[in-house]
């Protein structure tokens, strides 16, 4: 959850791709002003998830969740929170 | 800001070889079914995407990482 908070648009796009929902992907790509060739490229990635079925999507989602909640990322998130707190304290 | 480990995973998915990508996934989830799935997806992406497609996908990632929503 903490990692999703750090870059929500990334997880929006990732889960739209992995979910196989083209409308959802279009909506999330609009948020970053993706061009037509960029949308086409992302849809090609999405096609791979769709072609490989639900199990494939679940397994890859599991990988992303595992990495995002790993000590590599959580340590980073904690460090960022500490930095934020320091900046907020100094700002007062 | 995106976690470096996530960035590495995505970069390898787009620009690494299948072996490089699967090796990275194995560091986090070493289940055979997960690794086989990772290889299938990676091979599929490599087969579908041209050099230009990959440049465009990397451009989307740049936009994501520099977005106010990240």
């Amino acid at each position: 959850v903490k990692m999703a908070e750090t870059c929500p648009i990334f997880y929006d796009v990732f889960f739209a791709v992995a979910n196989g929902n083209e409308l959802l992907l279009d909506l999330s790509l609009t948020k970053v002003n993706a061009t037509e060739p960029e949308r086409t490229a992302m849809k090609k990635i999405q096609d791979c998830y769709v072609e490989n079925g639900l199990i494939s999507r679940v397994l890859d989602g599991l990988v992303m969740t595992t990495i995002s909640s790993s000590k590599d990322c959580m340590g980073e998130a904690v460090q960022n929170t500490v930095e934020d707190l320091k900046l907020n304290t100094l700002g007062r | 800001e995106i976690c470096p480990a996530v960035k590495r995973d995505v970069d390898l998915f787009l620009t690494g070889t299948p072996d490089e990508y699967v090796e990275q996934v194995a560091q986090y989830k070493a289940l055979p079914v997960v690794l086989e799935n990772a290889r299938i997806l990676k091979n599929c992406v490599d087969a579908k995407m041209t050099e230009e497609d990959k440049e465009n996908a990397l451009s989307v990632l740049d936009k994501i990482y520099t977005s106010p929503l990240c």
Partner: antibody
């Protein structure tokens, strides 16, 4: 025109250090993985290192691990190879080479820069 | 590490000859193999990638074949500008090893 140009080679004593540079032009540098490859006098090609477009992953050959460090500055379209604890066997022509995104081959090479390690 | 061996290491041929160079990998590398040509004092030049795909601008007399552990580079009719050293390289996994090279010389 897609181009890579190496610089920074020279004569250095064993145990010394040297920093090689590779300037890129004609393509979106930040998207591409770049390799360093070397060739000792009269010998074959030896892969040295690879750095990804965003520096998120880096690989080294065992022969240079712990002694060489690769880095890049995408804002300057530049790649670097910091070589420390140099040995006589590091004497070679050093090339930087772009790795393609789709087939992982080295499609564009620099002209090379010569490093000589000798006392 | 994946080892690559090339045969022959040295080859004498005449203009117009058909030349075949073989590269063996110590383990399967699918089609992740490239061939490069290098002339003295020059950087290597990509000829073939993905085992059999001709790089843009490379003459059609060059061709590649093979998959898994055995690969070949063929020059159908050797031209004067083809006298050089040829290297295979595996792109499957790091370290991205090169073969020891095959020097093609004038007979």
């Amino acid at each position: 025109e897609v181009q890579l140009v190496e610089s920074g080679g020279g004569l250095v004593k064993p145990g010394g250090s040297l920093r090689l540079s590779c300037a890129a032009s004609g393509f979106t540098f930040r998207n591409y993985n770049i390799n360093w490859v070397r060739q000792a006098p009269g010998k074959g090609l030896e892969w040295v290192s690879l750095i990804s477009g965003s520096s998120s992953y880096i690989y080294y050959a065992d022969s240079v691990k712990g002694r060489f460090t690769v880095s890049r500055d995408n804002a300057k379209n530049s790649l670097y190879l910091q070589m420390n604890s140099l040995r006589a066997e590091d004497t070679a022509v050093y090339y930087c080479a772009r790795r393609t995104l789709s087939y992982y081959v080295m499609d564009v090479w620099g002209q090379g820069t010569t490093v000589t390690v000798s006392s | 590490d994946i080892q690559l061996t090339q045969s022959p290491s040295f080859l004498s041929a005449s203009v117009g000859d058909r030349v075949t160079i073989t590269c063996w990998a110590s383990q399967g590398i699918s089609s992740y193999l490239a061939w490069y040509q290098q002339k003295p004092g020059k950087a290597p030049k990509l000829l073939i990638y993905s085992a059999s795909t001709l790089q843009s601008g490379v003459p059609s007399r060059f061709s590649g074949s093979g998959s898994g552990t055995e690969f070949t580079l063929t020059i159908s009719s050797l031209q004067p500008e083809d006298f050089a050293t040829y290297y295979c390289q595996q792109l499957n996994s790091y370290p991205f090893t090169f073969g020891p090279g095959t020097k093609v010389d004038i007979k």
